[in-house]
């Protein structure tokens, strides 16, 4: 069991570092802040954010070729439950510095617990998404 | 008030087998995984296995699979373990207990518990 | 031996703070929830606290419980003599596909 313990890590290790999780994170931001938008935020208001979506993709033509892109690479971690966690962890760290406040970050967690499913995937059981923003350790 | 309450504990002799049963009662026992947690005597907890609200899905710890049976009968609010081939390391409370997990992204935890009934396997 | 490792005991005075470690690996801790669970002598285990930091009703703040990657923390201030007990970790395993324990650590009130 130990020995493909071993190789599974080393499979999903590999896997995350092919995957390109950019699309994903892109998908969510420009959702979140789609919904931000429609509370009353002026959508053209500037922003420092490299994320930050155009008026092109506020009217959704961009987002939806960002969640096209994120679902064929989530696609690839459909058959390791575990693997799609650690996806999934990963997005949520890598943007955990760009939430602005807890809200944003409350917002960013629900949309991204949605992924999976949006995709027509299944969620990963009991995947714990409450990541710091001190960065996790990588086995 | 949720109750959990453990029979069918007994000593039995290595190689016998031996069916636990678990009432439960104050709180909608299909909406909930349940668990069965042993503990040798003297010493730590044992998770011995997991079934699903509607029985569709059960895990086992590895020294047990194949020997014990977790099932559920939601109609009368019964937890069962059937454990059969059993051997000195089976020894210990068994403890039922309702376990909180939900969805995808919560954890298994363990909010009620029985008072736990004594297996003690023996020649 | 148990895959969660929790130091076998820990003291401090009445009042003062004791924190209990709880040490995994990717797999379980570091994916997954962790929960903590309080057993009193010749009594059943009681929840302390879910999913990493999340207090049960009628469990005083006084208990708490942080994650950080692969590892776990219970803290417990304002310590009393009724604290004295058994203390245990437990989270999924996916490798595994199972629920560990770790193997306890046993708080004395001084």
């Known amino acids: 069991r130990q020995q493909w313990e071993l190789q599974g890590d080393r499979r999903c290790q590999s896997q995350l570092e092919r995957a390109n999780l950019r699309p994903c994170e892109q998908h969510l931001m420009q959702k979140i802040q789609r919904d931000e938008d429609s509370y009353g935020r002026d959508p053209y208001s500037p922003s420092q954010d490299p994320y930050s979506p155009s008026p092109y993709d506020r009217r959704g033509a961009g987002s939806s070729q960002h969640q096209e892109r994120c679902c064929n690479e989530l696609n690839e971690f459909e058959n390791n439950q575990r693997c799609m966690c650690e996806a999934l962890q990963q997005i949520m760290e890598n943007q955990s510095d760009r939430l602005q406040g807890r809200q944003q970050e409350q917002q960013f967690k629900r949309e991204l617990r949605n992924l999976p499913q949006q995709c027509g995937l299944r969620a990963p059981q009991r995947c714990d998404l409450e990541v710091e923003s001190g960065g996790r350790d990588r086995y | 008030e949720v109750q959990l309450v453990e029979s069918g504990g007994a000593l039995v002799q290595p190689g016998g087998s031996l069916r636990l049963s678990c009432a439960a009662s104050g709180f909608k026992f299909s909406t909930f995984y349940m668990t069965w947690i042993r503990q040798a005597p003297g010493k730590g907890l044992e998770w011995v296995a997991n079934i699903k609200q509607d029985g569709s899905e059960k895990d086992y710890l590895d020294s047990v699979r194949g020997r014990f049976n977790i099932s559920r009968d939601n109609a009368k609010s019964v937890l069962y373990l059937q454990m059969n081939t059993l051997s000195a390391d089976d020894t210990g409370v068994y403890y039922c207990t309702r376990n909180g997990l939900q969805d995808s992204y919560s954890g298994d935890f363990f909010d009620h518990w029985g008072q736990g009934i004594l297996v003690t396997v023996s020649s | 031996q148990s895959v969660l490792t929790q130091p076998p005991s820990v003291s401090a005075a009445p009042g003062q703070k004791v924190t209990i470690s709880c040490s995994g690996t990717?797999?379980?801790?570091?994916?997954?929830?962790v929960s903590w669970y309080q057993q009193l002598p010749g009594t059943a285990p009681k929840l302390l606290i879910f999913d990493n930091t999340k207090r049960p009703s009628g469990i005083p703040d006084r208990f708490s419980g942080s994650k950080s990657g692969s590892s776990a923390t219970l803290g417990i201030t304002g310590l009393q003599t009724g604290d004295e007990a058994d203390y245990f970790c437990?989270?999924?395993?996916?490798?595994?596909?199972?629920?560990?324990f770790g193997g306890g650590t046993k708080l004395t009130v001084l």
């Open positions: 437990a989270t999924w395993d996916a490798d595994l596909s199972a629920v560990l």
């Open positions: 990717g797999s379980n801790i570091g994916h997954n929830y």
